[in-house]
């Protein structure tokens, strides 16, 4: 299953299978997840140790037990691959990282006025993977403000140094956020030059485009067919670059297909697994396993539940079959793409879903009436659970927020449907930022259920908590994915990083905003809150938030929208915005339901019709 | 020039066998993996069975499992289809259609169709 | 099995119009999307190959998108020879099921 926790003070000891430098312990984990071997990473931050060469350190390990033995080392930091994590897999790491220079190949030098400008510039930038801003105080007068744009052969830094007054960070080109667009057509019967990146084995060319796509140096492939003339090279996926991010020349080739990365594509990337199934054809590989089931779907769940499993081979031979079982193969190679395709076999073939990000239709949890007053305009991708609950009916009007946990679930405050209990009324907007974009084109979802908690009164703050099942599950994507759910009565979390998102009023007697805001609020004590609030009763079920001299808060508008806190580098939902006195007034904190204390009712509401628990563990 | 051509459709009594013939010229037949598709007359397409490259690996839509069988012969270059125990809702155009290479399998070269009645 | 859902189910055009068709699958199917045409008495033709792929000798004005589940044909100016019914089809896994079909008619 999925494992999210994260081990401070501890270094896996042996199984390495690659190691690079990275920023932080959140890259290594990322770099660790899309990786085809690693289940385990550690991390050495440039605190933990004083050998230059292993500062920032990420050490990516193999183990047949999916465990290894952990030593003592202060400060390093040690987790598991996010395979198997659902939609908490992804490519997209937005962090800056202030007094670090990431080093590369420096391909292209310009003066920016702040590190987000040198950021977008990476972003917009075919090869750019990573960037170093030199700030307006850095000690050299003539390198302040330069934006230096970065490659390596591995994606990742060749070295990283603690300098003062550099903040650098990683290409948003896959959180879909580039402004290049891509290239979707594939063209038949046509070959492109120039220098192969790496070479891999695939079945078909939509699996040669993924495997580019998430690769670090790949812009565009080759693929040669089962018919290709050459024996050997029948299968091949060349994945390529050149110097000037586009094929030099392409020749007109029969049995071959061409195509380009859809890294630089905006607000939609390929999933980074193959989901396919191909009938008749024998995927060969190292073997992990060799189980007897019924039926090819079967076996390619078993693929992904067993985490070193790559690919799989279902067997119809009469000789691999007893009763209505036969033998699924369970293999593995380096690369994690077969080392051998045979056509014309009875077998099915097809890879393991450890990395897709769709999940199954679940709500996300992990183990371990109000606009934003004081905030700033959000970016594309930032808060991918926030949904717009709109109601329609001569005119439509945004009324309240709410999070996305699930493929079909939005949790929200029970006062939004105040008045207004009818389904049909409403539309669900996910995966957008400005409300301006909404026209009559834009697809919404539609409401099959309101649960409103059984205890929630109108006019009373208690139990402010419903639960929406959308007619039709939501496909996830780097704008549009759930939120996950703190554990059940959670109190021993201390969270020091929130926000709260929404469109809602920015002053008490304001207007609905068009541009997502957000705005980081500290928690509040329920004792403090208490205080604050003497006419009403704070309950345990409640959490407050806000600055003891106000000025930023939730308003109208942002009810029912997330409070969610980051602790070891994942969001969880902490508040749903419920109520508190005007907005961003003085000693006035805003108060959330608490989630946590609702666990329960969430899970027993969110169950299928046929009992099983719609709940998606990632610990 | 790429071409499939089906032959083999007619008239027959519910219960009755026909066997469909699928001669394709033109592009390398052993290497490709074939299907059946059909079209009931005003109808949409059905997908009716496919068949891997060598012959070795067959599937079938339920609504013909255990009637129809799907075979080939690559020395022929020629893709069949054996019906039996024909009923009234397998009137229809029967095609004959080769998948793509690489491409996902989509069908991609497909024969004019015959005929197929099945009636009393 | 996985259903696949066109839509509208017919619609009225004339020559030089962007014509847009849906198709929706009852699960995600990834990119193995396809779009065939086809014209009365004849077979279909293949038009779009993995939702956005286009077939070899087919015009550019046809074009495909989208993914998992939802799905867009769009003939950007539509011409005298592409009145015909539009088939959506998946390759995702058997049973490889069409929608029921889109007849595209002159108004």
């Known amino acids: 299953g999925c494992l999210t926790q994260l081990y401070e003070n501890a270094f896996f000891r042996g199984g390495d299978v690659a190691s690079m430098y990275t920023p932080n312990a959140q890259y290594c984990q990322m770099r660790c997840t899309f990786h085809p071997r690693c289940l385990l990473f550690s991390f050495l931050p440039a605190s933990s140790i004083n050998d230059m060469e292993k500062r920032f350190g990420c050490f990516l390990k193999d183990s047949v037990t999916g465990t290894l033995p952990k030593v003592h080392r202060t400060g390093a930091v040690s987790g598991h691959s996010l395979k198997q994590c659902g939609h908490q897999i992804s490519a997209c790491h937005r962090d800056i990282y202030k007094g670090v220079d990431m080093r590369g190949v420096n391909f292209n030098v310009s003066k920016v006025s702040s590190v987000e400008e040198c950021q977008k510039r990476c972003t917009s930038n075919i090869r750019c993977q990573f960037f170093s801003y030199a700030t307006q105080t850095f000690h050299k007068a003539e390198y302040r403000n330069n934006c230096l744009l970065k490659y390596s052969p591995g994606g990742t830094p060749t070295a990283i140094k603690v300098l003062s007054n550099v903040e650098s960070g990683f290409s948003l080109k896959p959180c879909a956020l580039s402004e290049i667009g891509c290239h979707m057509n594939i063209f038949q019967h046509l070959a492109f030059s120039d220098v192969d990146v790496a070479r891999v084995l695939t079945p078909d060319a939509f699996v040669c485009r993924t495997i580019c796509t998430y690769h670090p140096n790949c812009l565009f492939f080759t693929f040669y067919t089962n018919v290709w003339k050459i024996e050997s090279q029948r299968n091949v996926c060349l994945l390529k670059t050149s110097e000037s991010g586009t094929p030099s020349s392409s020749t007109p080739q029969e049995n071959t297909i061409s195509g380009y990365s859809l890294l630089t594509c905006k607000r939609t990337l390929p999933e980074p697994c193959h989901s396919k199934i191909y009938p008749g054809v024998d995927f060969g590989g190292e073997e992990l396993n060799v189980t007897f089931v019924k039926g090819v779907n079967v076996c390619q769940e078993t693929c992904t539940k067993m985490i070193r499993c790559q690919f799989f081979t279902y067997s119809l031979l009469p000789e691999d079959c007893k009763e209505e079982k036969c033998k699924c193969f369970l293999r593995l190679s380096m690369d994690g793409s077969p080392t051998r395709i045979a056509y014309g076999t009875q077998g099915s073939s097809g890879y393991s879903l450890r990395l897709c990000n769709t999940g199954d239709n679940s709500v996300c949890t992990t183990k371990t009436s109000t606009r934003i007053v004081g905030g700033t305009n959000s970016s594309w991708g930032e808060w991918p659970w926030q949904v717009s609950l709109q109601v329609k009916l001569t005119a439509q009007r945004h009324l309240c927020g709410g999070s996305l946990i699930g493929h079909q679930w939005v949790l929200t405050a029970a006062h939004c449907f105040d008045g207004l209990p009818l389904q049909d009324v409403w539309r669900i907007y996910s995966g957008i930022l400005n409300l301006s974009d909404i026209t009559k084109d834009t697809p919404f979802s539609q409401i099959k259920e309101i649960i409103i908690h059984q205890n929630y009164k109108v006019s009373e703050g208690n139990h402010d908590i419903a639960l929406i099942k959308l007619q039709a599950p939501l496909n996830y994507t780097e704008f549009q994915k759930p939120i996950c759910l703190p554990s059940k009565g959670d109190t021993s979390t201390i969270y020091t990083n929130c926000w709260v998102t929404g469109w809602g009023f920015s002053k008490e007697k304001g207007e609905i905003q068009n541009i997502l805001q957000k705005v980081n609020i500290p928690l509040v004590t329920n004792e403090e809150c208490q205080k604050r609030y003497q006419d009403y009763k704070i309950t345990q079920r409640m959490v407050c938030a806000g600055y003891k001299e106000g000025g930023k808060d939730a308003c109208k508008g942002d009810s029912g929208g997330p409070l969610v806190c980051k602790h070891n580098g994942m969001w969880r939902l902490v508040g749903i915005t419920s109520w508190g006195e005007g907005c961003a007034r003085r000693e006035q904190p805003g108060v959330y339901t608490k989630v946590a204390e609702y666990m329960d009712w969430i899970l027993e509401k969110t169950q299928s019709s046929d009992g099983k628990a719609q709940m998606q563990s990632p610990a | 020039e790429v071409q499939l051509l089906e032959s083999g459709g007619g008239l027959v009594q519910p219960g009755g066998s026909l066997r469909l013939s699928c001669a394709a010229s033109?592009?390398?037949?052993?290497?490709?993996?074939m299907v059946w598709v059909r079209q009931a007359p005003g109808k949409g397409l059905e997908w009716v069975s496919s068949?891997?490259?060598?012959?070795?690996?067959?599937l079938y839509a339920d609504s013909v499992k255990g009637r129809f069988t799907i075979s080939r012969d690559n020395s022929k270059n020629t893709l069949y289809l054996q019906m039996n125990s024909l009923r009234a809702e397998d009137t229809a155009v029967y095609y004959c259609a080769s998948m793509n290479l690489g491409g996902g399998d989509a069908f991609d070269i497909w024969g004019q169709g015959t005929m197929v009645t099945v009636s009393s | 099995d996985i259903q696949m859902t066109q839509s509208p189910s017919s619609l009225s055009a004339s020559v030089g119009d962007r014509v847009t068709i849906t198709c929706r699958a009852s699960?995600?199917?990834?990119?193995?999307l396809n779009w065939y045409h086809q014209k009365p008495g004849k077979a279909p033709n293949l038009l779009i190959y993995?939702?956005?792929s286009l077939q070899s000798g087919v015009p550019s004005r046809f074009s495909g998108s989208g993914s998992g589940t939802d799905f867009t044909l769009t003939i950007s100016s539509l011409q005298p020879g592409d009145f015909a019914t539009y088939y959506c089809?998946?390759?995702?896994?058997?049973?490889?099921?069409f929608g029921g079909g889109t007849k595209v008619e002159i108004k």
């Open positions: 068949i891997g490259s060598s012959g070795g690996f067959t």
């Open positions: 993995g939702a956005s």
């Open positions: 699960q995600s199917i990834g990119i193995y």
């Open positions: 033109g592009f390398t037949f052993s290497s490709y993996a």
């Open positions: 089809q998946h390759s995702y896994s058997t049973p490889f099921t």
